[in-house]
């Protein structure tokens, strides 16, 4: 009879065990365990009748189609085998054990005691059939196994082979290389690869297989397993396989599809191809005169681009437009996108006008082309070129006039200062009292007329000032403050100020330049009580043209000591000699009560201590500060007076050979102007040089050399 066993383990004994088994007996045990397991069988006791080749009694172990072992006897001999310690393993999940005894037993035999169990099959170790084994990685587990793939691969639906996803490859460059996946390693199985070459219309794709070509093939049937097919429009080339690469292919198309198919077996290295775009050829190019073409090639094809540039000093000229470079392209029909432009010599064109300067051409015919040269110069003697620049400019390759120092910036013509068009009188003899100034003797002298309409009735007064540049007047702060409130410093509005320059005789203003004020700047620390910091600036609405009667005075170097005692200086003004004259009379042109003609006086600088003592001895709170100096004579007789306020006290500077403004007429008194031991007090300008430059928006170094040459 047959016993069916389905457990994962169990025990099998001969009939009657442990007693002797009966004669003429046959029992079959069929053991079935789940897939992924095999059966292990071993015997703990075995005692059967011995016979040649186990003809009488035996235990036979088999599978469906194979006898695994036949046992009989008590111990193993040449012709019979006992299991002993031997273990019987089934190849699969089924094992059949048959016990048979014949009709006679000469002795009493106890039979057998056997045990079985299901044991795991390690499929990863034992699968040698390529059709069943994992393509890449195998993972065993109790009762089964599974396959996985390397990075970049996908497990096929057969759960065994590894394929790649390679159906979405687009190539748009004009040249490229395409290979089978993982080339030159064996390509993946079960894969469908699609490569699209899509170029711009006008190109034609040429294919060339290179290096190794190894695709699984068949001796009789053309490419049944793996293959390449090339699809050009409706036409299909291939299939291609084996070890011989196809010949180069000229597709005559800008769009090509390459199909690569692999089945689930085989180990072949694959393929590699390069593709190249071919286009129509364009005619040969000639570079322009004074120019070049880049890149320089023997032949140019569709989509090739060339850059036309010119030699230094020349510009590309295309359709009357100047440019640095010009690009043209070979079109799909084999023509160039544009004609080759010409190279035209760079033209810097007419140089920029120089304020207060002139231009002379060094090159014949007043040429303004590349490498031409011009020279700027200033309108001497009224202006001088800043930093003694050469003024030479060359037409550069960039089309701009360039100076070695200034680059493309124009030079600056600065007003010459402190050099009257007629020389001031010698300082040998002392002048008692004032004298008429010749025209052009004090070209920096400014008449400042103020009409303050912010008060009712309007206030009118005047003072003097000194021209520092074409746009700035230096004066005393008290001239430019509102007069009506004696203890407050309120600057007059710029609208209320008129400046006259080049004025000699106040009765004849026709030859003078009159200018409105753009800004009125009083020193922020001006003190109305003691006239400390009595200095101010007026910026003119428009720069004034310089000439023999209008020229700036020089500013001093920054010297806290100020002018040395006993130095002689000159001061000019239209100040009134008659103290009872009114402003209305001063400003009306017909008056004889003020000095119609500009007056000047020569005065020595008074030692500071002497002046201080002179004022301290008076009743009243007079203060001669370090920002002031005094000038005049002990015996009196000559002095500055009302209306001279803000005028420049100038001293000739031997070093620079120029007249320098050292003082500004500030205050004096309380006695009448020119009284004995009443020195005129002047603002010490050298203490304010930095402040002045700052207000004028010029770095000191710009103008300083003019004084110190």
């Amino acid at each position: 009879h047959t016993v069916e066993l389905n457990n994962m383990f169990g025990q099998i004994q001969s009939p009657g065990y442990p007693d002797s088994y009966p004669s003429d007996s046959e029992v079959t045990w069929n053991i079935t365990v789940p897939d992924g397991f095999r059966i292990k069988l071993y015997f703990m006791h075995f005692n059967l009748e011995s016979s040649y080749l186990c003809e009488y009694d035996y235990v036979k172990v088999e599978t469906e189609d194979q006898v695994l072992a036949t046992f009989c006897g008590r111990e193993t001999t040449d012709t019979e085998q006992t299991p002993g310690q031997e273990v019987v393993l089934s190849p699969g999940s089924f094992m059949s054990i048959t016990f048979r005894s014949d009709f006679s037993n000469e002795e009493r035999f106890t039979g057998f005691d056997a045990h079985y169990m299901a044991v795991d099959v390690d499929e990863c170790k034992e699968r040698e059939d390529e059709e069943l084994s994992c393509d890449h990685y195998c993972h065993n587990y109790i009762g089964g196994y599974y396959c996985s793939c390397r990075f970049g691969y996908i497990l096929h639906t057969d759960n065994r082979t590894c394929r790649v996803e390679c159906s979405d490859n687009l190539f748009t460059q004009r040249t490229g290389v395409i290979t089978s996946p993982d080339f030159p390693n064996p390509y993946p199985k079960s894969s469908e690869c699609l490569y699209t070459i899509e170029l711009e219309e006008g190109f034609m794709v040429n294919l060339q297989f290179e290096d190794i070509f190894d695709i699984e093939d068949h001796p009789e049937v053309p490419c049944p397993y793996d293959y390449i097919k090339i699809k050009v429009g409706p036409k299909v080339l291939g299939p291609f396989c084996g070890e011989k690469a196809p010949e180069p292919i000229s597709t005559q198309s800008h769009s090509v599809l390459i199909l690569f198919h692999s089945d689930n077996s085989g180990e072949n290295r694959g393929w590699r191809l390069s593709y190249r775009a071919a286009g129509n050829e364009c005619p040969e190019l000639q570079p322009p005169v004074h120019g070049k073409i880049e890149p320089s090639q023997a032949k140019y094809f569709f989509k090739d681009q060339v850059l036309v540039s010119c030699d230094t000093g020349y510009k590309v000229l295309k359709d009357n437009v100047e440019m640095d470079t010009f690009q043209i392209e070979c079109l799909k029909d084999g023509t160039w996108s544009n004609k080759i432009p010409t190279c035209k010599i760079v033209d810097c064109r007419a140089p920029g006008e120089l304020e207060h300067g002139l231009i002379t051409f060094s090159t014949r015919n007043n040429l303004t082309t590349y490498k031409s040269e011009i020279k700027y110069s200033c309108q001497e003697p009224y202006y001088k070129m800043l930093n003694n620049n050469t003024g030479i400019y060359t037409c550069s390759a960039q089309g701009v006039w360039m100076n070695k120092v200034l680059g493309r910036s124009l030079p600056t013509c600065l007003p010459e200062c402190g050099q009257p068009s007629r020389s001031l009188p010698s300082l040998v003899k002392r002048i008692i009292g004032g004298r008429n100034a010749e025209p052009g003797l004090f070209p920096w002298q400014a008449l400042i007329v103020v009409e303050d309409t912010s008060r009712v009735p309007n206030d009118k007064w005047f003072g003097s000032g000194a021209l520092l540049s074409a746009s700035w007047i230096l004066t005393a702060a008290h001239v430019l403050r509102s007069q009506r409130r004696d203890t407050t410093v309120i600057p007059v509005s710029k609208e209320h100020v008129t400046v006259y320059l080049g004025l000699h005789d106040v009765r004849d203003k026709s030859g003078a330049v009159n200018s409105s004020a753009a800004r009125v700047v009083l020193h922020p620390d001006f003190n109305i009580q003691n006239y400390n910091h009595d200095i101010a600036l007026v910026q003119l609405q428009e720069p004034v043209p310089l000439g023999p009667h209008v020229m700036p005075v020089c500013l001093p170097r920054l010297e806290p000591e100020g002018p040395a005692p006993h130095m002689l200086g000159l001061v000019a003004g239209w100040g009134i000699s008659n103290p009872n004259v009114t402003v209305d009379e001063i400003i009306s042109s017909g008056t004889r009560t003020l000095s119609d003609v500009l007056q000047y006086v020569k005065l020595p600088v008074v030692p500071h201590a002497e002046c201080k003592t002179s004022y301290e001895s008076r009743s009243g709170n007079y203060s001669v500060t370090e920002n002031m100096f005094c000038a005049g004579y002990y015996e009196g007789g000559k002095d500055t007076c009302l209306g001279d306020s803000g005028g420049a006290f100038v001293i000739f500077d031997d070093l620079s050979q120029r007249w320098v403004v050292q003082g500004l007429v500030s205050w004096g008194g309380p006695e009448e102007c020119g009284s004995k031991q009443v020195y005129g007090v002047y603002t010490k300008v050298s203490n304010y040089v930095d402040w002045v430059w700052e207000q004028m928006g010029l770095p000191q170094s710009v103008v300083e050399p003019q004084v110190e040459r």
Partner: antibody, heavy 113, light 112 residues
Framework: QVQLVQSGAEVKKPGASVKVSCKAS????????IEWVRQAPGQGLEWIGE????????NYNEKFKGRATFTADSSTSTAYMELSSLRSEDTAVYYC??????WGQGTLVTVSS | DIVMTQSPDSLAVSLGERATINCKSS????????????LAWYQQKPGQPPKLLIY???TRESGVPDRFSGSGSGTDFTLTISSLQAEDVAVYYC????????FGQGTKVEIK
């Protein structure tokens, strides 16, 4: 012709503030100083201060510094005087005048608890 | 501050007679730059704002009758009504604007 029109009378409690307005017409408002003067009942004239509307420049009588504030609105040609921390002795008629010549009609400010 | 002192405090004058008011300042009101004395005279009638009569010590404001005149310089100034009229009854103030302005205490002019 030049005219200055002031705001109406005010009654204020001690410690409060008052703001008097002065609207100008007939001339360029920004270009002339506006002065403020007061006159206590039966008393003389006392100068408070001034403002130049175009620039905002001000001058104050020391006595009123910190208590009086002058402002001007060029768009409406109106000057303002604000007096704070009022006390009974501030009861007066307050006048604005264009620099020295033209006066407003006056604004009576009464300070009473 | 500059102190302005008027004299007399009040004045009774017959119609058509001369009236003289004095004003003294504690410091000079002459600005040497503009050569102006910054002194003005005002007339105030009851219930009205003051009215400008004289500026710069001696210049008559337009529209002011010529019986009103001003004189003086430095620290001493005078307002003269050459022939008093009934409409001239008022309080007269001097004002200096040389510095932060100050007024005189006022002079009351009445008809005798």
């Amino acid at each position: 012709q030049v005219q200055l029109v002031q705001s109406g009378a005010e009654v204020k409690k001690p410690g409060a503030s008052v703001k008097v307005s002065c609207k100008a017409s007939g001339y360029t408002f920004t270009g002339k100083w506006i002065e403020w003067v007061r006159q206590a009942p039966g008393q003389g004239l006392e100068w408070i201060g001034e403002i130049l509307p175009g620039t905002g420049s001000t001058n104050y009588n020391e006595k009123f510094k910190g208590r009086a504030t002058f402002t001007a609105d060029s768009s409406t040609s109106t000057a303002y005087m604000e007096l704070s921390s009022l006390r009974s002795e501030d009861t007066a008629v307050y006048y604005c005048l264009r620099s020295e010549d033209v006066w407003g009609q006056g604004t009576l400010v009464t300070v009473s608890s | 501050d500059i102190v302005m002192t008027q004299s007399p405090d009040s004045l009774a004058v017959s119609l058509g007679e001369r009236a003289t008011i004095n004003c003294k300042s504690s410091q000079s009101l002459l600005n040497t730059r503009t050569r102006k004395n910054y002194l003005a005279w005002y007339q105030q009638k009851p219930g009205q704002p003051p009215k400008l009569l004289i500026y710069w010590a001696s210049t008559r404001e337009s529209g002011v009758p010529d019986r009103f005149s001003g004189s003086g310089s430095g620290t001493d100034f005078t307002l003269t009504i050459s022939s008093l009229q009934a409409e001239d009854v008022a309080v007269y103030y001097c004002k200096q604007s040389y510095n932060i302005p100050t007024f005189g205490q006022g002079t009351k002019v009445e008809i005798k």
